[in-house]
């Protein structure tokens, strides 16, 4: 990563260093240390103070984005004296060269697409590269298949999501022969970026007085169980006047997903379609294919 680290320190330095791959800030251990503290301040003056590691000469920042530039700070007291040191972590490179409009979505339960746009001041020969690290930081995933626009990487397709965890760190680096390119980074929750498939196996069975709709919950990337789903049924009478309200029915997920409603014979032709969402986010899937029941002469 092309980022300059500039140290602001008194004469006897702690030699503070930051490894952006592990998000670990470390410094030279001092004898007879009585107190240590590390923190960062971002451009909006928000302060993040992680727990110190066991050896007390390093700390790891779990969930931070660095592209706006941050300042790290370490305070150490020993029985003899106090130390303080700042480390500036700017996003070096020309302003406006970083990838922008970055977004990702998971679909079909095991595929993910990420897309971005070239920075407005990025030179013609800019090339972007995507790296993903899971929250356990055990693995770095490099984009296996880039989506290109005139030779520039503007997206990434992943068909193996096994390295992801529930929260992941995305980094888009840039290179150019002409100038330094800024990086862009982002933290994304898999549950917030997944687009569900519609429910499957939708069936309708009617008797003389009622119709029973059954369906199966969609397969998802996240490990969800039945209570995590909310469904919406659109029961629609065919050949009605334009502007007639469809009946939208909300149904909570259950071990057996079913909805029973009164509909007596002879019944007009109806259609039913269903969509699914995470009950806490209500990010609706597309509708399932409409299933028809009833008769034209009902």
């Amino acid at each position: 990563e092309k980022s300059d680290l500039r140290t602001v320190a008194p004469a006897s330095s702690l030699n503070v260093r930051f490894d952006s791959r592990t998000m670990n800030l470390s410094w030279d251990c001092q004898e007879n240390t009585t107190f240590s503290k590390c923190f960062l301040t971002d451009k909006k003056n928000r302060v993040v103070e992680p727990r110190l590691s066991n050896n007390e000469c390093s700390c790891t920042f779990r969930e931070i984005c660095l592209h706006e530039g941050v300042t790290f700070e370490v305070h150490v007291n020993t029985s003899q004296r106090g130390f303080q040191q700042k480390l500036l972590y700017p996003n070096s490179g020309r302003e406006g060269t970083a990838a922008q409009n970055f977004s990702c979505f998971i679909y079909n339960a095991d595929l993910m697409n990420c897309t971005w746009a070239r920075g407005p001041t990025a030179p013609r020969d800019v090339q972007y590269f995507l790296y993903i690290r899971n929250s356990k930081r055990r693995r770095e995933i490099r984009c296996p298949y880039y989506i290109q626009d005139s030779g520039t990487h503007v997206g990434c397709h992943l068909d193996n999501l096994s390295g992801l965890t529930s929260r992941n760190y995305f980094l888009v680096n840039g290179t150019s022969r002409e100038i330094g390119i800024q990086f862009f980074d982002s933290l994304l929750d898999t549950k917030k970026i997944e687009r569900f498939n519609p429910p499957s196996n939708v069936t309708v069975r009617c008797n003389t007085t009622h119709c029973l709709v059954r369906w199966k919950q969609p397969r998802t990337y996240q490990k969800l169980s039945y209570l995590d789903f909310q469904y919406q049924l659109d029961v629609h009478r065919k050949n009605t006047q334009p502007g007639t309200e469809n009946l939208l029915i909300n149904v909570s997920g259950d071990l057996e997903n079913r909805y029973n409603f009164p509909s007596s014979e002879p019944r007009a032709k109806h259609s039913v379609k269903i969509r699914a969402a995470d009950v806490r986010i209500l990010n609706w899937s597309s509708w399932s294919e409409a299933i028809e029941f009833g008769s034209d002469d009902g």
């Epitope: 490990k223 169980s225 209570l227 995590d228 071990l255 057996e256 009950v279």
Partner: antibody, heavy 120, light 111 residues
């Protein structure tokens, strides 16, 4: 109608093992996650373990580690709990349950329970 | 010793409203993790009453509602009925641990 049918009450001597079964009807076990919880008058409910999708394996509560084993036979839709080196304070009602949500763990449907008495 | 603290008993007359509190800490309810509530009628298995803080599974009447704020949660029962007499338990998870942690339970008596 989904149901969890548990095996009958057991009386065991200290140091012995007990195996409790939990048969699922009305649904395929392979599509479900089963967790086990026990209840005593003194300690109340204690979660024992179950399938954790993040780890993709069965995880056990620390306090039962080494003494508890949870297995499944999906061909007969039955889950099993084995607890070994029984002590008198293992006397409890043992419940199997179906996970309704993983985040956080929510137990959606419970079996009727199996009373295990440990007494010399 | 239960991780979540509940009153040992509450009571109310038929038709009344009662609430049951559940107090945790910053490493469970306040972490923040969602809270579930279970009802255990005498001599029976627990039944899920509320999940994700305030959602009811199908079949649970809307007389039961719940809320969560900070490190505590509460269950409210309106229009109290004789067959609501039961033990009620709250549950959530503890940061860094797998599985559920439970409250000690509250016995509801309908006078």
């Amino acid at each position: 109608q989904v149901q969890l049918v548990q095996s009958g009450a057991e009386v065991k001597k200290p140091g012995a093992s007990v195996k409790v079964s939990c048969k699922i009807s009305g649904h395929s076990l392979s599509e479900l996650s089963i967790h086990w919880v026990r209840q005593t008058p003194t300690k109340g409910f204690e979660w024992m373990g179950g399938f954790d999708p993040e780890e993709n394996e069965i995880v056990y509560a620390q306090r039962f580690q080494g003494r508890v084993t949870m297995t499944e036979d999906t061909s007969i839709d039955t889950a099993y709990l084995t607890l070994s080196s029984l002590r008198s304070d293992d006397t409890a009602v043992y419940y199997c349950s179906i996970v309704g949500s993983f985040s956080p763990l929510t137990l959606g449907l419970w079996g009727k329970g199996t009373m295990v008495t440990v007494s010399s | 010793q239960a991780v979540l603290t509940q009153p040992s008993s509450v009571s109310g007359a038929p038709g009344q409203r009662v609430t049951i509190s559940c107090t945790g800490s910053g490493s469970n309810i306040g972490a923040p993790y969602d809270v579930s509530w279970y009802q255990q009628l005498p001599g029976t298995a627990p039944k899920l009453l509320i999940y994700h803080n305030n959602k009811r599974p199908s079949g649970v009447p809307d007389r039961f509602s719940a809320s969560k704020s900070g490190t505590s949660a509460s269950l409210a029962i309106t229009g109290l009925q004789a067959d609501d007499e039961a033990d009620y338990y709250c549950a959530t998870v503890e940061a860094g641990l797998s599985g559920s942690v439970f409250g000690g339970g509250t016995k509801l008596t309908v006078l």
